[in-house]
Protein backbone atom coordinates (compact mmCIF):
# COMPACT_ATOMS: atom_id res chain seq x y z
CA UNK A 1 0.00 0.00 0.00
CA UNK A 2 0.82 3.39 -0.43
CA UNK A 3 2.45 5.08 2.50
CA UNK A 4 3.90 8.51 1.17
CA UNK A 5 2.30 11.43 3.73
CA UNK A 6 -0.52 12.55 0.94
CA UNK A 7 -1.71 8.77 0.68
CA UNK A 8 -2.01 8.55 4.53
CA UNK A 9 -4.06 11.81 4.72
CA UNK A 10 -5.91 11.34 1.76
CA UNK A 11 -6.08 7.39 3.35
CA UNK A 12 -6.89 8.88 6.85
CA UNK A 13 -10.04 11.57 5.05
CA UNK A 14 -11.71 8.48 4.33
CA UNK A 15 -11.34 6.72 7.34
CA UNK A 16 -12.78 10.11 8.97
CA UNK A 17 -15.86 10.66 6.62
CA UNK A 18 -16.95 6.51 6.85
CA UNK A 19 -16.61 7.17 10.42
CA UNK A 20 -19.02 10.43 10.63
CA UNK A 21 -16.09 12.43 11.42
CA UNK A 22 -15.03 11.54 14.75
CA UNK A 23 -12.13 13.10 15.47
CA UNK A 24 -9.78 11.72 18.37
CA UNK A 25 -6.85 14.33 19.10
CA UNK A 26 -4.00 11.31 17.50
CA UNK A 27 -6.14 10.72 15.04
CA UNK A 28 -3.99 12.94 12.48
CA UNK A 29 -2.24 12.39 9.61
CA UNK A 30 1.28 13.62 11.21
CA UNK A 31 0.49 10.93 14.09
CA UNK A 32 -1.00 8.27 11.88
CA UNK A 33 1.59 5.79 10.36
CA UNK A 34 0.84 3.75 7.49
CA UNK A 35 1.01 0.89 9.91
CA UNK A 36 -2.39 1.56 11.07
CA UNK A 37 -4.13 1.24 7.56
CA UNK B 1 -9.84 30.75 7.09
CA UNK B 2 -7.13 28.46 6.17
CA UNK B 3 -4.47 30.78 4.95
CA UNK B 4 -0.66 29.88 4.02
CA UNK B 5 1.03 32.92 3.64
CA UNK B 6 4.59 32.96 2.35
CA UNK B 7 7.46 36.03 2.63
CA UNK B 8 8.57 38.22 -0.22
CA UNK B 9 10.51 38.22 -2.90
CA UNK B 10 14.06 37.59 -2.81
CA UNK B 11 17.20 38.03 -4.87
CA UNK B 12 20.51 36.59 -3.88
CA UNK B 13 23.65 36.28 -6.02
CA UNK B 14 25.08 32.47 -6.71
CA UNK B 15 26.53 30.62 -4.06
CA UNK B 16 24.14 32.03 -0.93
CA UNK B 17 21.40 30.85 0.75
CA UNK B 18 17.93 31.92 0.62
CA UNK B 19 15.41 30.97 3.48
CA UNK B 20 11.59 31.35 2.52
CA UNK B 21 8.94 31.02 5.44
CA UNK B 22 5.24 30.05 5.24
CA UNK B 23 2.60 31.21 7.84
CA UNK B 24 -0.02 29.12 8.43
CA UNK B 25 -3.32 29.59 10.24
CA UNK B 26 -7.16 28.46 10.47
CA UNK B 27 -5.65 25.34 11.14
CA UNK B 28 -4.00 23.13 13.77
CA UNK B 29 -0.50 23.29 12.16
CA UNK B 30 0.82 20.22 13.21
CA UNK B 31 -1.83 17.49 12.33
CA UNK B 32 -0.76 18.26 8.56
CA UNK B 33 2.31 17.10 6.49
CA UNK B 34 4.07 20.65 4.85
CA UNK B 35 5.39 20.22 1.45
CA UNK B 36 7.09 22.15 -0.95
CA UNK B 37 6.93 22.71 -4.57
CA UNK B 38 8.86 24.90 -6.92
CA UNK B 39 8.48 26.10 -10.49
CA UNK B 40 11.17 27.55 -12.76
CA UNK B 41 9.75 29.98 -15.41
CA UNK B 42 8.08 28.57 -17.73
CA UNK B 43 8.68 24.81 -16.27
CA UNK B 44 6.52 21.95 -15.11
CA UNK B 45 6.18 22.19 -10.97
CA UNK B 46 8.98 19.94 -9.13
CA UNK B 47 8.78 18.88 -5.78
CA UNK B 48 10.98 19.44 -3.18
CA UNK B 49 9.91 17.49 -0.33
CA UNK B 50 7.68 17.44 2.92
CA UNK B 51 8.16 17.61 6.97
CA UNK B 52 5.59 16.87 9.37
CA UNK B 53 5.52 19.62 11.93
CA UNK B 54 4.48 17.77 14.92
CA UNK B 55 7.91 15.33 14.63
CA UNK B 56 9.96 17.13 12.58
CA UNK B 57 10.82 14.60 10.33
CA UNK B 58 11.63 15.36 6.63
CA UNK B 59 11.56 13.34 3.49
CA UNK B 60 13.51 15.08 0.27
CA UNK B 61 13.65 14.99 -3.37
CA UNK B 62 16.80 13.28 -3.99
CA UNK B 63 17.40 16.09 -6.51
CA UNK B 64 17.90 18.81 -3.46
CA UNK B 65 18.81 16.68 -0.85
CA UNK B 66 22.07 18.62 1.23
CA UNK B 67 20.99 21.78 -0.22
CA UNK B 68 17.53 22.47 1.15
CA UNK B 69 16.58 22.16 4.59
CA UNK B 70 12.72 21.91 5.80
CA UNK B 71 12.30 23.21 9.23
CA UNK B 72 9.22 24.17 11.28
CA UNK B 73 8.73 26.34 14.27
CA UNK B 74 5.35 24.86 15.93
CA UNK B 75 4.82 28.01 18.14
CA UNK B 76 4.73 30.68 15.03
CA UNK B 77 2.79 27.50 12.89
CA UNK B 78 5.46 28.60 10.16
CA UNK B 79 7.38 26.62 7.90
CA UNK B 80 10.64 26.98 6.42
CA UNK B 81 12.09 26.52 3.34
CA UNK B 82 16.09 27.07 3.47
CA UNK B 83 18.16 26.20 -0.63
CA UNK B 84 21.84 26.84 0.00
CA UNK B 85 24.30 27.27 -2.49
CA UNK B 86 22.33 28.74 -5.22
CA UNK B 87 22.79 28.59 -8.83
CA UNK B 88 21.01 30.19 -11.67
CA UNK B 89 18.58 27.44 -11.91
CA UNK B 90 17.43 27.85 -8.63
CA UNK B 91 15.49 31.20 -9.97
CA UNK B 92 11.49 30.02 -9.45
CA UNK B 93 8.81 30.31 -7.80
CA UNK B 94 8.63 28.50 -4.09
CA UNK B 95 5.01 27.43 -2.69
CA UNK B 96 4.40 25.61 0.72
CA UNK B 97 1.22 23.84 0.35
CA UNK B 98 -0.34 21.33 2.59
CA UNK B 99 -3.63 19.03 2.45
CA UNK B 100 -6.03 19.66 5.55
CA UNK B 101 -8.87 17.15 6.72
CA UNK B 102 -10.33 19.76 9.20
CA UNK B 103 -11.84 22.62 9.25
CA UNK B 104 -12.27 21.46 5.28
CA UNK B 105 -10.69 18.97 3.06
CA UNK B 106 -9.06 20.63 1.00
CA UNK B 107 -4.74 20.94 -0.69
CA UNK B 108 -4.00 24.67 -0.04
CA UNK B 109 -1.21 26.66 -1.32
CA UNK B 110 0.62 29.22 -0.32
CA UNK B 111 0.91 32.62 -2.96
CA UNK B 112 4.54 31.50 -3.58
CA UNK B 113 7.72 33.60 -2.66
CA UNK B 114 9.69 34.21 -5.52
CA UNK B 115 13.67 33.97 -5.51
CA UNK B 116 15.78 35.55 -8.21
CA UNK B 117 19.28 33.99 -8.54
CA UNK B 118 21.69 36.46 -10.18
CA UNK B 119 25.32 37.76 -10.03
CA UNK C 1 11.47 8.63 -10.30
CA UNK C 2 8.15 8.11 -11.50
CA UNK C 3 8.02 10.01 -14.69
CA UNK C 4 4.44 11.96 -15.82
CA UNK C 5 3.85 12.12 -19.34
CA UNK C 6 1.14 14.56 -20.03
CA UNK C 7 -0.71 15.05 -23.37
CA UNK C 8 -1.79 17.08 -25.49
CA UNK C 9 0.76 20.16 -24.28
CA UNK C 10 -1.69 22.60 -25.35
CA UNK C 11 -5.15 22.28 -26.74
CA UNK C 12 -7.13 24.86 -28.59
CA UNK C 13 -11.03 24.99 -27.90
CA UNK C 14 -13.98 27.12 -27.59
CA UNK C 15 -16.81 27.94 -24.60
CA UNK C 16 -18.96 24.66 -24.13
CA UNK C 17 -16.17 22.45 -25.61
CA UNK C 18 -15.72 18.71 -24.31
CA UNK C 19 -11.79 18.60 -23.49
CA UNK C 20 -9.54 15.92 -22.32
CA UNK C 21 -6.41 15.38 -21.35
CA UNK C 22 -4.52 12.57 -20.46
CA UNK C 23 -1.27 11.37 -18.38
CA UNK C 24 0.60 8.54 -18.57
CA UNK C 25 3.19 7.10 -15.78
CA UNK C 26 5.90 5.69 -16.49
CA UNK C 27 5.24 2.75 -13.96
CA UNK C 28 1.83 1.85 -11.41
CA UNK C 29 0.81 4.34 -9.20
CA UNK C 30 -2.37 3.00 -8.33
CA UNK C 31 -4.71 5.60 -8.25
CA UNK C 32 -2.31 7.85 -6.18
CA UNK C 33 -2.70 10.67 -8.57
CA UNK C 34 -3.71 14.14 -8.55
CA UNK C 35 -4.76 17.32 -10.85
CA UNK C 36 -3.64 21.10 -10.68
CA UNK C 37 -5.29 24.20 -12.33
CA UNK C 38 -3.21 27.27 -12.64
CA UNK C 39 -3.48 30.27 -13.97
CA UNK C 40 -0.70 32.95 -14.90
CA UNK C 41 0.81 34.30 -11.99
CA UNK C 42 -1.12 32.42 -9.17
CA UNK C 43 -0.87 29.17 -7.53
CA UNK C 44 -1.90 25.54 -8.45
CA UNK C 45 -5.52 24.93 -7.03
CA UNK C 46 -6.46 21.56 -6.74
CA UNK C 47 -9.52 20.02 -8.66
CA UNK C 48 -8.86 16.39 -8.51
CA UNK C 49 -7.40 13.53 -5.53
CA UNK C 50 -7.69 9.93 -5.78
CA UNK C 51 -7.81 10.06 -9.69
CA UNK C 52 -11.43 10.62 -9.48
CA UNK C 53 -12.80 12.79 -6.25
CA UNK C 54 -13.24 16.31 -6.81
CA UNK C 55 -12.14 18.47 -3.94
CA UNK C 56 -15.22 20.59 -2.62
CA UNK C 57 -15.83 23.14 -4.81
CA UNK C 58 -14.51 21.86 -7.66
CA UNK C 59 -17.02 22.41 -10.31
CA UNK C 60 -18.69 19.05 -11.24
CA UNK C 61 -17.80 19.61 -15.05
CA UNK C 62 -14.11 18.61 -13.89
CA UNK C 63 -14.10 15.42 -13.59
CA UNK C 64 -11.29 12.44 -13.39
CA UNK C 65 -10.48 8.71 -14.35
CA UNK C 66 -7.59 6.12 -14.49
CA UNK C 67 -5.74 3.86 -12.65
CA UNK C 68 -1.80 2.21 -12.70
CA UNK C 69 -0.73 4.35 -15.39
CA UNK C 70 -3.36 5.42 -17.40
CA UNK C 71 -5.31 8.71 -16.45
CA UNK C 72 -7.43 11.33 -18.03
CA UNK C 73 -8.67 14.88 -16.70
CA UNK C 74 -12.14 16.25 -18.47
CA UNK C 75 -14.05 19.07 -18.86
CA UNK C 76 -17.56 18.60 -19.69
CA UNK C 77 -18.44 21.81 -21.15
CA UNK C 78 -15.08 24.34 -20.76
CA UNK C 79 -16.36 28.10 -19.24
CA UNK C 80 -14.45 30.89 -19.82
CA UNK C 81 -12.66 30.42 -16.00
CA UNK C 82 -11.40 27.35 -17.13
CA UNK C 83 -8.59 28.80 -19.32
CA UNK C 84 -5.30 27.80 -17.59
CA UNK C 85 -2.81 25.21 -17.64
CA UNK C 86 -3.70 21.70 -15.88
CA UNK C 87 -0.84 19.48 -14.23
CA UNK C 88 -1.18 16.14 -13.06
CA UNK C 89 0.83 14.85 -9.92
CA UNK C 90 1.59 11.05 -8.67
CA UNK C 91 1.97 10.55 -5.07
CA UNK C 92 2.25 6.90 -5.07
CA UNK C 93 6.00 7.63 -4.08
CA UNK C 94 8.43 9.67 -3.28
CA UNK C 95 9.50 11.69 -4.94
CA UNK C 96 6.36 13.11 -6.21
CA UNK C 97 5.92 14.19 -9.27
CA UNK C 98 4.26 16.20 -12.19
CA UNK C 99 3.28 15.98 -15.57
CA UNK C 100 4.79 18.79 -17.94
CA UNK C 101 0.95 20.75 -18.03
CA UNK C 102 -1.52 21.21 -20.66
CA UNK C 103 -2.57 24.62 -21.65
CA UNK C 104 -5.97 25.21 -22.89
CA UNK C 105 -6.03 28.00 -24.70
CA UNK C 106 -8.99 29.81 -27.06
CA UNK C 107 -9.58 28.77 -29.70
Known amino acids: ACDTATCVTHRLAGLLSRSGGVVKNNFVPTNVGSKAF | EVQLVQSGAEVKKPGASVKVSCKAS????????MNWVRQAPGQRLEWIGDINPNSGVTTYNQKFKGRATLTVDKSASTAYMELSSLRSEDTAVYYC????????????WGQGTTVTVSS | DIQMTQSPSSVSASVGDRVTITCKAS??????VAWYQQKPGKSPKALIYSASYRYSGVPSRFSGSGSGTDFTLTISSLQPEDFATYYC?????????FGGGTKVEIK
Open chain 2, 97 to 108: ASIIIVPDYFDY
Open chain 2, 26 to 33: GYTFTDYY
Open chain 3, 27 to 32: QNVGSN
Open chain 3, 89 to 97: QQYNSYPYT
